[in-house]
């Protein structure tokens, strides 16, 4: 059902990055406009992006809210300068979107390497804990803050002067790696959440390279 | 239900090489890497390697450099070793196994390798 | 590489009885450790992820302890089921190298 002129949104998708969460919709509008509705399985439904002729919605301030709820959105379809009215069944044209759980689905964002310091054979390498958009008690909470030990990193490690790679784990953001004396060394990591099925690793990270900026080097 | 099936036994002769593959099912196969193993009576259980399906990115055991080559086919959602310049001290059992980054929870049926003349 | 030491190589246990072996690494792992179960002729079975995590589908009888270097697998009344060699990998760092296994029959 629905108004004449109008058609109903489509192939609704949910784009999230370390909980920035996007709802898309096709069509592009024509001569008409879009509102987006969200709720959890047990919630009210919440309006956002009134009558907007974007096919976008940024819903990550209703979704931060508790990232481990299951959400569900739909977009409604209204006839331009015209929002009051109703398909024949009294309702405006909409369509639902998948379900969608940040906390399980979320991707996770492309890590950056902080720094490094090299102690003797030892460095140390640091990773950015990017912050999030998800509060508590009024503060961003980091990625590490969200996920904690759910969240793992995987290193790559390898002599600037060879191909061969090494790897190591944590569930911390620090590495502490062992490396050969006089060797510059290029690090990589990448985000891994184990628990997870799907979506359940990150691009790696920009490489990094000792001998550059943004690492440290103290020899004892 | 998840599944890794191997290619079947091989005979080879010292020198040659040999490629085992690993059919993957009821899984995402980008999201898991794939592992290698050998297991022979003398050396008991060795890491070959393993190939990350998400980004293809390979680690090889120090030995295997130079000797061992893990490759994909997407479309098919198969892992494959290639072993090259066998020795005799290659005859093991292989195995893939799919890895959830703090264990190896399913694992292929295994292929025997046997390397004589 | 990090060296992983299983003891007691073989152990003779009766039904019912508890049986602990123990896994040592020759650097700290935190608890990237794993145990497996393998029977002849077949692949391993994971038991134990994560150093103390019972994966799916293992019977409770079996539990696991231990961070950083050192590590044990208990069985806490033998099965006969249960005979098969044990093994223990550390997943921390590579090479991820595995234990030489401990052997466990029935007296």
């Known amino acids: 059902s629905g108004t004449t002129n109008t058609v109903a949104a489509y192939n609704l998708t949910w784009k999230s990055t370390n909980f920035k969460t996007i709802l898309e919709w096709e069509p592009k509008p024509v001569n008409q406009v879009y509102t987006v509705q969200i709720s959890t399985k047990s919630g009210d439904w919440k309006s956002k992006c009134f009558y907007t002729t974007d096919t976008e919605c940024d819903l990550t301030d209703e979704i931060v809210k508790d990232v481990k709820q299951t959400y569900l959105a739909r977009v409604f379809s209204y006839p331009a300068g015209n929002v009051e009215s109703t398909g024949s069944a009294g309702e405006p044209l909409y369509e639902n979107s998948p379900e969608f759980t940040p906390y399980l689905e979320t991707n996770l964002g492309q890590p950056t390497i902080q720094s490094f310091e090299q102690v003797g054979t030892k460095v140390n390498v640091t990773v950015e804990d990017e912050r999030t958009l998800v509060r508590r008690n009024n503060t961003f909470l980091s990625l590490r803050d969200v996920f904690g030990k759910d969240l793992i990193y995987t290193l790559y490690y390898w002599k600037s002067s060879s191909s061969g790679k090494k790897t190591a784990k944590t569930n911390t953001n620090e590495f502490l790696i062992d490396v050969d004396k006089g060797e510059n060394y290029c690090f990589s990591v990448q985000a891994v959440i184990p628990s997870r099925t799907v979506n359940r690793k990150s691009t790696d990270s920009p490489v990094e390279c000792m001998g550059q900026e943004k690492g440290e080097f103290r020899e004892i | 239900q998840i599944q890794l099936v191997q290619s079947g036994p091989e005979l080879v002769k010292p020198g040659a090489s040999v490629q085992v593959s690993c059919k993957t099912s009821?899984?995402?196969?980008?999201?898991?890497?794939v592992y290698w193993v050998r297991q022979s009576p003398a050396k008991g259980i060795e890491w070959i390697g393993y190939i990350d399906p998400y980004n293809g990115l390979t680690i090889y055991e120090q030995n295997f450099r130079g000797k061992g080559t893990l490759s994909l086919d997407h479309s098919t959602s198969t892992a494959y070793m290639e072993l090259n310049s066998l020795r005799y001290e290659d005859t093991a059992v292989y195995f893939c196994?799919?890895?959830?980054?703090?264990?190896?929870?399913?694992w292929g049926q295994g292929t025997s390798v046997t390397v004589s003349s | 590489d990090i060296q992983m030491t299983q003891s007691p190589a073989s152990i003779s246990a009766s039904i019912g009885e508890r049986v602990t072996i123990t896994c040592l690494a020759s650097?700290?792992?935190?608890?990237?450790l794993a145990w497996f179960l393998q029977k002849p002729g077949r692949s391993p079975n994971l038991l134990i992820y994560?150093?103390?995590n019972l994966a799916d589908g293992v019977p409770y009888r079996f539990s696991a302890s231990g961070s950083g270097n050192d590590f044990s697998l208990t069985i806490s009344s033998l099965n006969p089921e249960d005979v098969a060699t044990y093994y223990c990998q550390q997943v921390y760092s590579s090479p991820f190298t595995f234990g030489q296994g401990n052997k466990l029959e029935i007296r």
């Open positions: 994560a150093a103390t």
């Open positions: 009821g899984y995402s196969f980008t999201d898991y890497n």
């Open positions: 650097q700290t792992i935190d608890t990237w």
């Open positions: 196994a799919r890895d959830v980054t703090t264990a190896l929870d399913f």
